[in-house]
């Protein structure tokens, strides 16, 4: 009686059950009732990461440094090359085929977490004692300056974009 | 590169035995099956047998079974046919040849066998 | 046992006209298990088709298969000196036997 289901790592063909390549490896031949599946290979730029009963092997990822892409880790027969960005750059998607520019955190707004090959810079609003007066990609939310610990008081309230600014306490003669 | 190179052949009485060797190369012998098919001169192809990969499976044209044994021995990369009691009809050029499930792909240059008295 | 009914047995033709041989088989070939050689005298055969239509490694494309079920056949589109020869049918979808047709001979008109 011919089967209808096969087990793991087999596949069934013409009501017979036969092997799957393993990875790294591409289907030549299905298997008979007297030899097995046929696999090859694949070649140096190509892979396949799973059993398979594929007959072509997917060509490597380029990492195309016109588009800011560098190697991150090399692919294998089994595995595919992992691109990442050029520093000051990250992925635009999670397959990284493109990479843009890191923003920049706007004046009242810090860094919360720098920007990775492939993360763009998250940005928080400065809370209150805080401020940022620059456009950055780096800089946190700085405190605003403690006039008290210089024996000086506030003259101008700081903002999320300013500091303080502090001047001498008024003196009585 | 791949090859079959088949050897044992010649000329033998009738009800006498001879055995053909069969000798692979470039590629991996243990993964496939093995054919024996013969030619009678100036005739067709006739298939006669065949082996699995490990041995395990043969079958036989009715022709000779019961006569001729198809055998292997991966170790030495050899398929063998064992031909018992011949007749003037098993007088052929006899090739073996490669299984795949796309025919029989890579064949031997063949060893001719003469059954006469 | 698949019978398989090669015609015409004879083939005569001039380089570079259309060869067209057929091969019936006597029940279904299941799966289209049907295949093509070429063989030249004091030669062993070569696999031209497998699959009915499927071309083998290193062949030339001139040489095409089709049919399926019982009715089979093996074109050659613009023949070559080189293509004078006798052609089998195999099935390998039924057996044992795995049977050969009786073959046909194209030579040269």
């Known amino acids: 009686e011919p089967p209808t289901a096969c087990r793991e790592k087999q596949y069934l063909i013409n009501s017979q059950c036969c092997s799957l390549c393993q990875p790294g490896q591409k289907l030549v031949s299905d298997c008979t009732e007297f030899t097995e599946t046929e696999c090859l290979p694949c070649s140096e730029s190509e892979f396949l990461d799973t059993w398979n009963r594929e007959t072509r092997c997917h060509q490597h990822k380029y990492c195309d440094p016109n588009l800011g892409l560098q190697v991150q880790q090399k692919g294998t027969s089994e595995t595919d090359t992992i691109c990442t960005c050029e520093e000051g750059l990250h992925c635009t998607s999670e397959s990284c085929e493109s990479c843009v520019p890191h923003r920049s955190c706007l004046p009242g707004f810090g860094v919360k977490q720098i920007a990775t090959g492939v993360s763009d810079t998250i940005c928080e609003p400065c809370p209150v004692g805080f401020f940022s007066n620059v456009s950055s990609a780096f800089e946190k939310c700085r405190p605003w300056t403690s006039c008290e610990t210089k024996d000086l008081v506030v003259q101008q309230a700081g903002t999320n974009k300013t500091d303080v600014v502090c001047g001498p306490q008024d003196r009585q003669r | 590169q791949v090859q079959l190179v088949e050897s044992g052949g010649g000329v033998v009485q009738p009800g006498r035995s001879l055995r053909l060797s069969c000798a692979a190369s470039?590629?991996?012998?243990?993964?496939?099956?093995m054919h024996w098919v013969r030619q009678a001169p100036g005739k067709g192809l006739e298939w006669v047998a065949v082996?699995?990969?490990?041995?395990?499976?043969?079958y036989y044209a009715d022709s000779v079974k019961g006569r001729f044994t198809i055998s292997r021995d991966n170790s030495k990369n050899t398929l063998y046919l064992q031909m018992n009691s011949l007749r003037a009809e098993d007088t052929a050029v006899y090739y073996c040849?490669?299984?795949?499930?796309?025919?029989?792909?890579?064949w031997g240059q063949g060893t001719m066998v003469t059954v006469s008295s | 046992e698949i019978v398989l009914t090669q015609s015409p047995g004879t083939l005569s033709l001039s380089p570079g006209e259309r060869a067209t041989l057929s091969c019936r088989a006597s029940?279904?070939?299941?799966?289209?298990?049907l295949a093509w050689y070429q063989q030249k005298p004091g030669q062993a055969p070569r696999l031209l088709i497998y699959?009915?239509?499927s071309l083998a490694t290193g062949i030339p494309d001139r040489f095409s298969g089709s049919g399926s079920g019982t009715d089979f056949t093996l074109t050659i589109s613009r023949l070559e000196p080189e293509d004078f020869a006798v052609y089998y049918c195999?099935?390998?979808?039924?057996?044992?036997?795995?049977?050969f047709g009786g073959g046909t001979k194209v030579e040269i008109k």
């Open positions: 470039g590629f991996t012998f243990e993964k496939y099956g």
């Open positions: 029940q279904s070939v299941s799966y289209s298990y």
């Open positions: 040849a490669r299984d795949t499930s796309r025919g029989h792909d890579i």
């Open positions: 195999q099935q390998y979808s039924d057996y044992p036997p795995f049977t």
């Open positions: 082996i699995s990969y490990e041995g395990t499976k043969k």
């Open positions: 699959g009915a239509s």
